[in-house]
């Protein structure tokens, strides 16, 4: 290299990461093998579980607002699960990204898209539940499957928008030991007049914005919605939470537990720009917490099934029946203060009595897409006891 050849500018933390060399330590190799095995298994499980959830919820169940939320959550998780095999490959080849810069950007973007989509969708689910209880009349008139799909599309658009910086600033960086990193390079685009200042401000901006938008704000919305619902239900004298409430609680808890550590380390990483002493902690911890965040996509489908109160009995029946019993709106199970007659009419507004793929009206948006993707959905759906009951009452 000539004396005046300008090297690719890297932030100090990134350059130091590029200097880290691999160990040939036997115990570390065993950990690597275990990690590959674990991620491989998670990839397989995630794809199968979320695929099954999408198929069952999208094609074998009567569409409600609740199933719409779950459908989109499962779609987000399926995307994340689909990217896991490539992360597994990265681990298998010795923590080196051999799939090129474009795929590095795409792969990472899926991770962040899932992060934002999950946070936004869980917020929407909580707000939906809150509106049902706090504004029941408004919910009865406006809470439709079509509206829920529209909300989901807006949330997906917001998630994509928030993912753009992570796509732009993702890059492949050659390490000094020959391996390739797929990581943030915030100096990739318009580094500005001062790289130190740019590194610091952009790293902090990315870490803080994703912490706020994908974690803190959704959790605040979820917590305040839950508080509002609890207060209202206390006045109505209802004690036992509905099945859907338990499902949401489990999914939110999993979200907080899986994504919380990731955001903590992400903020530490931003702080490590000015405090190099934090860097070793970040380098050791970040791979683990990133994997934990990925595993959230594998955990969710399990939670959809496990939160069913009489799980063991219902697991003997079809998976569809289990899910159907879990994913019924509280309003459809006779929330406090609602009569059977009113419940029937609201059900007619918020859901078609037939399953997604054989509804008389043409399915819209993601539902149509799923119907097309899953050709077998064209078959007439099995009708569960709940569906039969609702079909007879709302016809």
């Amino acid at each position: 290299m000539s004396a005046n050849a300008t090297l690719k500018p890297l932030c100090p933390i990134l350059e130091q990461m590029s200097r880290l060399q691999s160990h040939s330590n036997t115990s570390i190799r065993y950990i690597d093998h275990a990690a590959v095995l674990l991620h491989g298994l998670a990839s397989l499980l995630g794809l199968v579980e979320n695929g099954v959830i999408l198929f069952v919820v999208g094609c074998r169940m009567r569409q409600t607002v609740v199933t719409t939320w779950v459908l989109h959550l499962a779609l987000s998780d399926l995307l994340a699960s689909a990217s896991l095999p490539f992360f597994t490959y990265f681990l298998a080849v010795g923590h080196s990204w051999e799939l090129g810069t474009t795929f590095c950007k795409l792969h990472s973007s899926i991770f962040f898209l899932n992060m934002f989509a999950s946070g936004f969708l869980l917020s929407a689910i909580s707000l939906d539940r809150c509106l049902q209880v706090v504004r029941p009349v408004w919910a009865q008139n406006h809470r439709t499957v079509a509206a829920a799909h529209k909300v989901c599309l807006v949330l997906w658009a917001l998630a994509v928008l928030n993912t753009v910086p992570y796509f732009v600033f993702r890059d492949t960086i050659s390490r000094l030991d020959g391996r390739i990193m797929c990581y943030y390079n915030v100096l990739l685009l318009n580094p500005g007049p001062d790289r130190d200042a740019t590194c610091n401000s952009r790293q902090v901006a990315l870490a803080v914005s994703k912490f706020l938008l994908a974690f803190l704000v959704p959790l605040a919305i979820i917590a305040s919605s839950h508080a509002a619902v609890s207060l209202r239900l206390q006045h109505r004298g209802r004690r036992r939470p509905g099945r859907f409430v338990r499902l949401v609680a489990a999914v939110v808890a999993a979200f907080a537990l899986c994504w919380g550590p990731y955001h903590v380390f992400s903020l530490l990483e931003a702080r490590a720009h000015a405090n190099p002493g934090l860097r070793p902690l970040v380098w050791r911890g970040l791979p683990f917490v990133t994997s934990l965040a990925f595993f959230n996509s594998v955990a969710n489908p399990v939670l959809y099934v496990l939160t069913c109160p009489d799980m063991l009995r219902k697991l003997r029946r079809s998976l569809r029946t289990v899910l159907e019993s879990v994913l019924v709106d509280d309003s459809e199970l006779g929330g406090a203060g609602s009569s059977r007659r009113r419940r029937t009419s609201s059900t007619a507004r918020s859901a078609s009595p037939l399953a997604l793929c054989s509804r008389p009206e043409e399915p819209r948006g993601p539902a149509r897409l799923l119907g097309w993707l899953l050709g077998s959905c064209a078959a007439s759906p099995q009708t569960g006891p709940l569906n039969r009951a609702l079909s007879s009452t709302s016809s």
């Epitope: 004396a3 890297l10 932030c11 100090p12 350059e15 130091q16 200097r19 001062d194 130190d196 200042a197």
Partner: antibody
Framework: EVQLVESGGGLVQPGGSLRLSCAAS????????MSWVRQAPGKGLEWVAR????????DYPGTVEGRFTISRDNSKNTLYLQMNSLRAEDTAVYYC???????????WGQGTLVTVSS | DIQMTQSPSSLSASVGDRVTITCRAS??????LAWYQQKPGKAPKLVVY???QLADGVPSRFSGSGSGTDYTLTISSLQPEDFATYYC?????????FGQGTKVEIK
């Protein structure tokens, strides 16, 4: 060809001040981080100050913090070291050095001697 | 501050000899180490950066190795132009300190 030429050294009394300059040529000065390194007569090397490529960030060791100030003028391709409250132990040859990336000094000037004595 | 301890402080060797200079940091510096060569009355010259990477224009007889706290500069076959003082320097956490130097003299 990369060139770094220091100037401004000389004899100064304890407590006095001095401003060193380093004229850079042969490379895009505004792209590189820069440092000052000194070497007392017959002794080892000591890093004195660092400045980011745009001049927003500076770093110093405790021995000179508060007394020395590093700055740069990218339009003039010049690096500066303002030395105040000079002590006898500041006597040394002062080198300006270019950072290869964020670290590692790949090019050095020939040095300028600063003598602090009464 | 991180202390850098170089050993030996001086050594005598002949042309063609294999020479090894070690540098020990008081804490892990994660390969953030450079080696410099300085001849009398001259400015230092970068030999190795990032512990193992040879700087531009440096002959392949020079090599750097090590990890954690212990690092080594090796000259596989000493040449007349290699007689000089060698310094290690860490770039982990400021202040970036140098070793006290190793003077390689002709035997």
């Amino acid at each position: 060809e990369v060139q770094l030429v220091e100037s401004g050294g000389g004899l100064v009394q304890p407590g006095g001040s001095l401003r060193l300059s380093c004229a850079a040529s042969g490379f895009t000065f505004s792209f590189y981080l820069m440092s000052w390194v000194r070497q007392a007569p017959g002794k080892g090397l000591e890093w004195v100050a660092r400045i980011s490529n745009g001049g927003s960030t500076t770093d110093y060791p405790g021995t000179v913090e508060g007394r020395f100030t590093i700055s740069r003028d990218n339009s003039k391709n010049t690096l500066y070291l303002q030395m105040n409250s000079l002590r006898a132990e500041d006597t040394a040859v002062y080198y300006c050095a270019r950072h290869r990336t964020n670290w590692d000094f790949d090019y050095w000037g020939q040095g300028t001697l600063v003598t602090v004595s009464s | 501050d991180i202390q850098m301890t170089q050993s030996p402080s001086s050594l005598s060797a002949s042309v063609g000899d294999r020479v090894t200079i070690t540098c020990r940091a008081s804490e892990n510096i994660y390969w953030n180490l450079a080696w410099y060569q300085q001849k009398p009355g001259k400015a230092p010259k970068l030999v190795v950066y990032a512990a193992t990477q040879l700087a531009d224009g440096v002959p392949s007889r020079f090599s750097g190795s090590g990890s954690g706290t212990d690092y080594t500069l090796t000259i596989s076959s000493l040449q007349p132009e290699d007689f000089a003082t060698y310094y290690c320097q860490h770039f982990w956490i400021t202040p970036w300190t140098f070793g006290q130097g190793t003077k390689v003299e002709i035997k």
